[in-house]
């Protein structure tokens, strides 16, 4: 997956830092105080969608073959720039009774982006 560098507008991963203070969770999340969640941004022209390394799945690739040839009902479907690889992260936080919980939270960090 591409990292956004400001030079291309093709689907890429953009760095984004989430601060738990910003969203009002800092009174019960102990650690970390924030993290790089990242997000996906950019265009998915038909020649990019479904190409190796940028596709969401085999399904995207085969559907894209039909879309490129104008087959109904796929002709008007737009390919979207979405996360294709996500990573978990460990968190330390208080539950309702102020007990400290350590948990690995799935799908916290966007690692790679691709066209659906």
């Amino acid at each position: 997956g591409l990292e956004c560098d400001g030079k291309v507008n093709i689907c890429c991963k953009k760095q984004f830092f989430v601060s738990f203070k910003d969203i009002g969770w800092n009174d019960w999340i102990i650690a970390p105080s924030g993290y790089h969640a990242n997000y996906c941004e950019g265009e998915c022209p038909s020649h990019i969608a479904g190409t190796s390394g940028s596709s969401l799945s085999f399904h995207s690739t085969v559907i894209n073959h039909y879309r490129m040839r104008g087959h109904s009902p796929f002709a008007n479907l737009k390919s979207c720039c979405v996360p294709t690889k996500l990573r978990p992260m460990s968190m330390l936080y208080y539950d309702d009774g102020q007990n400290i919980i350590k948990k690995d939270i799935q799908n916290m960090i966007v690692e790679e982006c691709g066209c659906s």
Epitope: I23, G24, N26, D96, I105
Partner: antibody, heavy 123, light 108 residues
């Protein structure tokens, strides 16, 4: 410390509307969902709905759909519950209660409650 | 929606006795998202137990919760005079949130 302070008692006529406020302090208002629960005299607790103060998204109990509106003003950390077309059986104490609603980290119970607002509907 | 049925409706006991309150769900409560509340006349409910068995902050250890799936129990090991009140269970694992009808614990 966390506090939820509700507006004062109201007396309304059938068919009218009532708007109850709930002012939050001691925590970051938009970090927790705000639920509304009511209790008719001598009866049990009844969940009415919830608002996410960050997004304004709401989820209402089917019974109140079309009659209840939950809103918020993040600038003054206040949630509102408006109930329209009041009937005599809407006479109850109305409570706001906060909860953590983040599924990935475990949902939260209603840990802090307002003191309640008595709404009396009478002709 | 999940219907919660509490039993008994009223429990008449003396101080020092053990109270056992039941809450039965019409379908399984997700991740044991079940809480117990105590309510006294003219007051807002107070959280006692969350997650079926965890005590809320400041709640004495004579209060304990147990159960999973559809059957939950609140136990008060030795009733103190201040424990005579109405107790409600709440499921908060799915929408709509639902409460049980309550159990009144009264002095015998």
């Amino acid at each position: 410390q966390v506090q939820l302070v509700q507006s004062g008692a109201e007396v309304k006529k059938p068919g009218a509307s009532v708007k109850v406020s709930c002012k939050a302090s001691g925590y970051t208002f938009f970090g927790y969902s705000m639920h509304w629960v009511r209790q008719a005299p001598g009866q049990g607790l009844e969940w009415m709905g919830v608002i996410n103060p960050s997004s304004g998204d709401t989820n209402y109990a089917q019974k109140f759909q079309g009659r209840v509106t939950m809103t918020r003003d993040t600038s003054i950390s206040t949630a509102y519950m408006e109930l329209s077309r009041l009937r005599s059986d809407d006479t109850a104490v109305y409570y706001c209660a906060r909860a953590r609603d983040i599924a990935a980290l475990g949902l939260g119970a209603f840990d802090y409650w307002g003191q309640g607002t008595l709404v009396t509907v009478s002709s | 929606e999940i219907v919660l049925t509490q039993s008994p409706g009223t429990l008449s006991l003396s101080p020092g006795e053990r109270a056992t309150l039941s809450c039965r769900a019409s379908q399984s409560v997700s991740s044991s998202y079940l809480a117990w509340y105590q309510q006294k006349p003219g007051q807002a409910p107070r959280l006692l137990i969350y997650g079926a068995s965890s005590r809320a902050t400041g709640i004495p250890d004579r209060f304990s919760g147990s159960g999973s799936g559809t059957d939950f129990t609140l136990t008060i090991s030795r009733l103190e005079p201040e424990d005579f009140a109405v107790y409600y269970c709440l499921q908060y694992g799915s929408y709509p949130r639902t409460f049980g009808g309550g159990t009144k614990v009264e002095i015998k």
